[in-house]
Interface confidence: medium
């Protein structure tokens, strides 16, 4: 049930998309069992969720990846939830780290991030990972979303 | 504070229950510090949360398991959050995967799943795992819930 | 948008703080990109989130830690979300466990906990870990929060 025209529900859940881009920013799509409540939240350039209204949002991301200790850098796999607000510096909101598995050819692991943050109108959130080529894109494994309180 | 009779709070949090059943669907109970806000969400057959009202729900599950690489299949431990709606195919909403530990006799790991999804009246959500015998049922380790936005 | 004076938004997100205390209870601070919606939720003694209003809350914590199997006890690293209410028993709401990594000097891992619980006026929630010295306090790695439904 909607909260009313003055205070509509705002929520999104988008699905990971494999990308040939070399950027560390994950790509997302409105596909499968996705959620996009209305135009008060949008997926921009397949990479960031942008909100039109100021307020408190619960923002979350889940990333499943497959890596091997020998084939990867010594640094762990890190997923970061980042914020970009108009006229402000980018900043990290949340991060999670998992050391690479010794399983061969690679070992799967899942990371979940989530927290409550104040967003300004026009603010965008996106997800960065240390190695996008290790991310698993099978059904349900990697997703990203938010909901306005 | 309730939102009013027209728009009551709808939320549930149920606790894992060990089961002798060989099914991959996890069993849950209204025990311990559980939540069941009202009859607009119910736990059916100890295995699925069913909602009476259409709307956006944040649905989550946490599964802790103990496994060993040598004693398990080569495939990772996978937890899946699944949806069954009246007159529709079952579908996977979220999945997480963790490679088995090399620790002996087994190594504990925890998986967390969560996302925002549109549910129809009569829709049910449930949790599947690759090997229910590996799931940890100690206080607080494995739980499942939802809240209506 | 606020829900109105009768039913204001209540939410918090606090950031981990390294502590010289030997207690297993994690310490938190209102620093960085934190959230504290109003005085209906407060951070007390840097260790617990205390609410003034009864109701259903989604409570979450994320803990990133770095440990090594050889240098740690055989028991896994466990993070517990605990509840303390006036005139009631303390109790564990949620727990997650991760076996220590074999990576050297230590392997990073992240744990996420979250669930919906009924809190009484004056109830406090806090996070316990088996070894606070292993917790990672870099930007975004370890945080704790709640939101009232």
């Amino acid at each position: 049930m909607q909260k009313g025209d003055q205070n509509p529900q705002i929520a999104a859940h988008v699905i990971s998309e494999a990308s040939s881009k070399t950027t560390s920013v994950l790509q997302w799509a409105e596909k499968g069992y996705y959620t996009m409540s209305n135009n008060l939240v949008t997926l921009e350039n397949g990479k960031q969720l942008t909100v039109k209204r100021q307020g408190l949002y619960y923002i979350y991301a889940q990333v499943t990846f497959c890596s091997n200790r020998e084939a990867s850098s010594q640094a762990p796999f890190i997923a970061s939830l980042c914020l970009k607000s108009p006229g402000r510096f980018e900043r990290i909101l949340l991060r999670a780290a998992n050391t690479h598995s010794s399983a061969k050819p690679c070992g799967q692991q899942s990371i979940h991030l989530g927290g409550v943050f104040e967003l300004q109108p026009g603010a965008s959130v996106f997800v960065n990972v240390t190695d996008p080529s290790q991310v698993s894109h099978g059904t349900g494994f990697t997703s990203f979303g938010l909901l306005k309180l | 504070m309730q939102k009013g009779d027209q728009n009551p709070q709808i939320a549930a949090h149920v606790i894992s229950e060990a089961s002798s059943k060989t099914t991959s669907v996890l069993q849950w109970a209204e025990k311990g510090y559980y939540t069941m806000s009202n009859n607009l969400v119910t736990l059916e057959n100890g295995k699925q949360l069913t909602v009476k009202r259409q709307g956006l729900y944040y649905i989550y599950a946490q599964v802790t398991f103990c496994s060993n690489r040598e004693a398990s299949s080569q495939a990772p431990f996978i937890a899946s959050l699944c949806l069954k709606s009246p007159g529709r195919f079952e579908r996977i909403l979220l999945r997480a995967a963790n490679t088995h530990s090399s620790a002996k006799p087994c190594g504990q790991q925890s998986i967390h799943l969560g996302g925002v999804f549109e549910l129809q009246p009569g829709a049910s959500v449930f949790v599947n795992v690759t090997d229910p015998s590996q799931v940890s049922h100690g206080t607080g380790f494995t739980s499942f819930g939802l809240l209506k936005l | 948008m606020q829900k109105g004076d009768q039913n204001p938004q209540i939410a918090a997100h606090v950031i981990s703080e390294a502590s010289s205390k030997t207690t297993s209870v994690l310490q938190w601070a209102e620093k960085g990109y934190y959230t504290m919606s109003n005085n209906l939720v407060t951070l007390e003694n840097g260790k617990q989130l205390t609410v003034k209003r009864q109701g259903l809350y989604y409570i979450y914590a994320q803990v990133t830690f770095c440990s090594n199997r050889e240098a740690s006890s055989q028991a896994p690293f466990i993070a517990s979300l605990c509840l303390k209410s006036p005139g009631r028993f303390e109790r564990i709401l949620l727990r997650a466990a991760n076996t220590h990594s074999s990576a050297k000097p230590c392997g990073q891992q992240s744990i996420h906990l979250g669930g919906v619980f009924e809190l009484q006026p004056g109830a406090s929630v806090f996070v316990n870990v088996t070894d606070p010295s292993q917790v990672s306090h870099g930007t975004g790695f370890t945080s704790f929060g709640l939101l009232k439904l």
């Epitope: - | 311990g32 510090y33 559980y34 100690g138 206080t139 | 209410s85 005139g87 009631r88 028993f89 109790r91 564990i92 009924e118 009484q120």
Partner: nanobody, 117 residues
Framework: EVQLVESGGGLVQPGGSLRLSCAAS????????MGWFRQAPGKEREFVAS???????YYADSVKGRFTISADNSKNTAYLQMNSLKPEDTAVYYC???????????WGQGTLVTVSS
């Protein structure tokens, strides 16, 4: 009928020890969390320690490392071993059964512990 009967209180010197017992009847101890609260003169009743049916134990910060809670299901009795007692531990100690979501559902009548030289 559910009943909780405490015993073992008394006068003890600082640094001394006492063991409180809580004999339960009318229910099976192993199905419930059990615990101890205390109320000092002029203060609110406060949580001391508890043990769940799973065997998990909890302690107030003020007693950690000094007090130990245990239960003997065969005797349907819960215990509180109190070591290194301090004057500030002086209070009436109450045994309680946990109704879980709804808090304590049964209390004992209390036993007085006085720590004084």
């Amino acid at each position: 009928e559910v009943q909780l009967v405490e015993s073992g209180g008394g006068l003890v010197q600082p640094g001394g020890s006492l063991r409180l017992s809580c004999a339960a009847s009318g229910f099976t101890l192993g199905n419930y969390a059990m615990g101890w609260f205390r109320q000092a003169p002029g203060k609110e009743r406060e949580f001391v320690a508890s043990i769940t049916s799973y065997g998990d134990t909890y302690y107030a910060d003020s007693v950690k490392g000094r007090f130990t809670i245990s239960a003997d299901n065969s005797k349907n009795t819960a215990y509180l071993q109190m070591n290194s007692l301090k004057p500030e531990d002086t209070a009436v100690y109450y045994c309680a059964r946990d109704g879980y979501t709804y808090g304590v559902d049964y209390w004992g009548q209390g036993t007085l512990v006085t720590v004084s030289s």
